[in-house]
Interface confidence: medium
C-alpha cells in the first residue's frame, strides 16, 4: 500500500495505490483511489510512467484529455469515468505488454488539494494449471498443464499423504514456447502416484503463484485450481 500526500499542508489529499501485476496480452488494472470531491469538474487525474515523456492518461473536467498521451499508450487506456466522483482513479490498461512494467505515478488534483502515489507494475504471464490423470502413460501418472507463463516459473509437486516429500526425481517438467515467442506452456508430469491421495502442482514465478490440486479415489476425481498474484502491496 502506498499512500501519498500533497506537498502543501492543508492543500494535500490522500492518494492510495496498490502494486499489481499485468498478464501480457490481457487487460490490466492500475489501482488508485483518492479522497473524493463533490464536483466531477474539479477533479484532475494524471497517470505518469517513469522514463516515459508523454502522459499515460489524463482525465479532467469529466472527460478524457489525451492530447499529451504518449504514443505507447495510445488507444490502450481508460479510467472508470462513472467512479471518479467516488474517488476511484484506477486505470484500465488494454492488451498489457512486457514493456508496460515499471513505476507509475497516480497524480490527483481536486478542489481540496493535490496528492500523488507511486505504483510498481510488473508484467508477465500466468495462468491456472489443470491436473489430470494421464491414462496414456504406462505407470500411474499425473499431468499438470498451464498454457501461459513468463518469466519461466518453477514447478513443485506436493502430496497430502507424503507431506514434505521431494518429488523432483519422480517428476519431469518441460517448457514449450508459445507461438508469440514470449510466453511458454508449462507441462509437468508426476510418476508413480497412488490412489486415495491429493496431489498439488505448484507453479511460481516472481509475479504469480498458481496451484492445481487433484484428489484421486476409485469413485471420484476432484480438481481445484487457485492463482495468487505476488507482491500486491498497497502504497
Amino acid at each position: 500500500l502506498i499512500i501519498g500526500f500533497g506537498i502543501s499542508g492543508r492543500h494535500s489529499i490522500t492518494v492510495t495505490t496498490v502494486a499489481s501485476a499485468g498478464n501480457i496480452g490481457e487487460d490490466g488494472i492500475l489501482s488508485c483511489t483518492f479522497e473524493p470531491d463533490i464536483k466531477l469538474s474539479d477533479i484532475v487525474i494524471q497517470w505518469l510512467k517513469e522514463g516515459v515523456i508523454g502522459l499515460v492518461h489524463e482525465f479532467k473536467e469529466g472527460k478524457d484529455e489525451l492530447s499529451e498521451q504518449d504514443e505507447m499508450f495510445r488507444g490502450r487506456t481508460a479510467v472508470f469515468a462513472d467512479q471518479v466522483i467516488v474517488g476511484n482513479a484506477s486505470l484500465r490498461l488494454k492488451n498489457v505488454q512486457l514493456t508496460d512494467a515499471g513505476t507509475y505515478k497516480c497524480y490527483i488534483i481536486t478542489s481540496k488539494g493535490k496528492g500523488n502515489a507511486n505504483l510498481e507494475y510488473k508484467t508477465g504471464a500466468f495462468s491456472m494449471p489443470e491436473v489430470n490423470v494421464d491414462y496414456n502413460a504406462s505407470s500411474e501418472t499425473l499431468r499438470c498443464e498451464a498454457p501461459r507463463w513468463f518469466p519461466q516459473p518453477t514447478v513443485v509437486w506436493a502430496s497430502q499423504v507424503d507431506q514434505g516429500a521431494n518429488f523432483s526425481e519422480v517428476s519431469n517438467t518441460s517448457f514449450e514456447l508459445n507461438s508469440e515467442n514470449v510466453t511458454m506452456k508449462v507441462v509437468s508430469v508426476l510418476y508413480n502416484v497412488t490412489i486415495n491421495n491429493t496431489y498439488s502442482c505448484m507453479i511460481e514465478n516472481d509475479i504469480a503463484k498458481a496451484t492445481g490440486d487433484i484428489k484421486v479415489t476409485e469413485s471420484e476425481i476432484k480438481r481445484r485450481s487457485h492463482l495468487q498474484l505476488l507482491n500486491s502491496k498497497a502504497s
Epitope: 490423470v133 505407470s139 500411474e140 469413485s219 471420484e220 476432484k222
Partner: antibody, heavy 119, light 108 residues
Framework: QVQLVESGGGVVQPGRSLRLSCAAS????????MHWVRQAPGKGLEWVAV????????YYADSVKGRFIISRDNSKDTLYLQMNSLRAGDTAVYYC????????????WGQGTLVTVSS | EIVMTQSPATLSVSPGERATLSCRAS??????LGWYQQKPGQAPRLLIY???TRATGIPARFSGSGSGTEFTLTISSLQSEDFAVYYC??????????FGGGTKVEIK
Amino acid sequence: QVQLVESGGGVVQPGRSLRLSCAASGFTFRSFGMHWVRQAPGKGLEWVAVISYDGSNEYYADSVKGRFIISRDNSKDTLYLQMNSLRAGDTAVYYCAKGGGLRWYFAYWGQGTLVTVSS
Amino acid sequence: EIVMTQSPATLSVSPGERATLSCRASQSISSNLGWYQQKPGQAPRLLIYGASTRATGIPARFSGSGSGTEFTLTISSLQSEDFAVYYCQQYNSWPPLTFGGGTKVEIK
C-alpha cells in the same frame, strides 16, 4: 454406491443403427473416462471404445472404428454408444464400464444390454 | 496390439483346493494387469488391479503376482462361489485394451 445401468439393446437388422445409453450414479461422472466392453454369446470380453472425462478424446477398437461413436452428456451423467452399419458379428452383450481412478482397468461394470443383429 | 494368453482354458478343482491361473502378455506390460471374475448371466467383477492389488471387498484368498509378461492369479482355497470364468486384461499399452481368452474354473 457406483451404479451403471445400460439400455437401448434389442434386435436389429444388418446395416441398421442402434443407440445404447448408460446412466451413471454414485460417483463424479464428469471426472472419469468411460468405456464400452462387449461379449459375444459364449465368447470372451472385447473392449470396444473409451471416451475421456470431458469428451475431448475417443478411442476405438479396430473392429468398430468408423461405425461406432462413443459420446457422453456430463450434465445428464450418461454415456452413449451410437452403433451404425451393424453386422452379425456385433451381436453381443454390451457393458458400460468405469475406468479405475488412475489406470484403465474396469473398476465398475453395468449389468449389460443385449444387442442382436439378425435378418 | 498386445495379445493376452490365458492357460489353462479350463481348470477342474475340488472345493477347498488351491487354484492357479496363468496369463501371459505378448510383450512387457509392467504391472499393468487386472483380473476379473464372471459368473453366468452376470457382469464381470474386478478382483485384482496393478497385478497384485486386491480391489475393494475382494476376499484375501484371491491373490495376484507377476510383472512383465508372466502373471498368476491364485485362489488359495476354492469356495463354491468361486467357480466362474476368470479373465486377465492389460492396460499398459492402448488402444486397444486387451483381454485374455478366459479360464473356466469348474468343480472337479
